[in-house]
Interface confidence: low
């Protein structure tokens, strides 16, 4: 139950968001944590041998619109999920590989958590 005085309104996203990073950690990250003004992401994609690889990290606000939605590479299997609601929110993102597509690009948006 909510304690007295605790707001039920959604928490505003932090101005600077901390995200878990894995395979996508910038040089200045500490303890696998990066900072961004945009989104945290977790992504799954196939490597050259067809094995699924999971990466996570920070997306800048400028440039994240497509990255959190589309798969620009033809026929590539990749899924990305993004979040902004709290620090390290991408720990709880679990994207799954989409089925193979026989078309050049995906029109439909990829899910934002």
């Amino acid at each position: 139950k909510k304690e007295d005085g605790e707001s039920t309104a959604p928490t505003p996203r932090p101005k600077i968001l901390r995200c878990k990073c894995h395979h996508h950690c910038p040089e200045d990250s500490v303890n696998n944590i990066c900072s961004t003004d945009g989104y945290c992401f977790t992504m799954i994609e196939e490597d050259d041998s067809g094995m699924p690889v999971v990466t996570s990290g920070c997306l800048g606000l400028e440039g994240s619109d497509f990255q959190c939605r589309d798969t620009p590479i033809p026929h590539q299997r990749r899924s990305i999920e993004c979040c902004t609601e709290r620090n390290e929110c991408n720990k709880d993102l679990h994207p799954t590989l989409p089925p193979l597509k026989n078309r050049d690009f995906v029109d439909g948006p990829i899910h934002h958590k």
């Epitope: 996508h24 992401f41 990290g57 800048g60 400028e62 440039g63 497509f66 990255q67 620009p72 690009f105």
Partner: antibody, heavy 116, light 113 residues
Framework: QVTLKESGPGILQPSQTLSLTCSFS??????????VGWIRQPSGKGLEWLAH???????SYNPALKSRLTISKDTSNNQVFLKIASVVTADTATYYC????????WGQGTLVTVSA | DIVMSQSPSSLAVSVGEKVTMSCKSS????????????LAWYQQKPGQSPKLLIY???TRESGVPDRFTGSGSGTDFTLTISSVKAEDLAVYYC?????????FGAGTKLELK
């Protein structure tokens, strides 16, 4: 401060390959989420998006021109390149590069004329 | 491809006049997961590069005067200039960034009466 600057050959002949360079500062294509796109504009006409490249080397092309376009990047030198093969006179235009998904920063443009 | 249609193609106005121009998309630009419309407006003056005015259909870019207002949702969008100044004479383009290929409207040219 973000700046972008396009460079190209100025004039070339039909059937040649057009090579364009976008040199930029104030942004890095190694930054996750960053992207740069190319747009062109024939004189007195509208804007046409050509291609886009992201920090992770994802690429997307205008399907109408895809067979002739190649976009690439040199992250360490802060440059993005566009090649258009087998140019025709209809490729005469001002070519712009711009940052991001919703082009917040544009270069000044470079005029390319295809003429026999 | 998403087709963007702008009207009118040109508009003769007097300084101080209120101006509205329309942009319609062939499919919805509203992404339900984040309730954002993936639409931008640009201003292009003669001999200059386009300049971003509005994104997310209604968010004014930093430094853009508040006489410029973007509105609309789904497939119908409007750019309004509350009181035209001489420096506003330009061509205005809308652009969708909902899906590939990115597409622009043909533009609305704002001219002096």
């Amino acid at each position: 401060q973000v700046t972008l600057k396009e460079s190209g050959p100025g004039i070339l002949q039909p059937s040649q390959t057009l090579s364009l360079t976008c040199s930029f500062s104030g942004l890095s294509l190694s930054t996750p989420g960053m992207s740069v796109g190319w747009i062109r504009q024939p004189s007195g006409k509208g804007l046409e998006w050509l291609a886009h490249i992201w920090w992770n080397d994802d690429k997307s092309y205008n399907p109408a021109l895809k067979s002739r376009l190649t976009i690439s990047k040199d992250t360490s030198n802060n440059q993005v390149f566009l090649k258009i093969a087998s140019v025709v006179t209809a490729d005469t235009a001002t070519y712009y590069c711009a940052r991001g998904d919703r082009f917040a920063y544009w270069g000044q443009g470079t005029l390319v004329t295809v003429s026999a | 491809d998403i087709v963007m249609s702008q009207s009118p193609s040109s508009l003769a106005v007097s300084v101080g006049e209120k101006v509205t121009m329309s942009c319609k998309s062939s499919q919805s630009l509203l992404y339900s997961n984040n309730q954002k419309n993936y639409l931008a407006w640009y201003q292009q003056k003669p001999g200059q590069s386009p300049k971003l005015l509005i994104y997310w259909a209604s968010t004014r870019e930093s430094g853009v005067p508040d006489r410029f207002t973007g509105s609309g949702s789904g497939t119908d969008f409007t750019l309004t200039i509350s009181s035209v100044k001489a420096e506003d004479l330009a061509v205005y383009y809308c652009q969708q960034y909902y899906s590939f290929p990115l597409t622009f409207g043909a533009g609305t040219k704002l001219e002096l009466k």
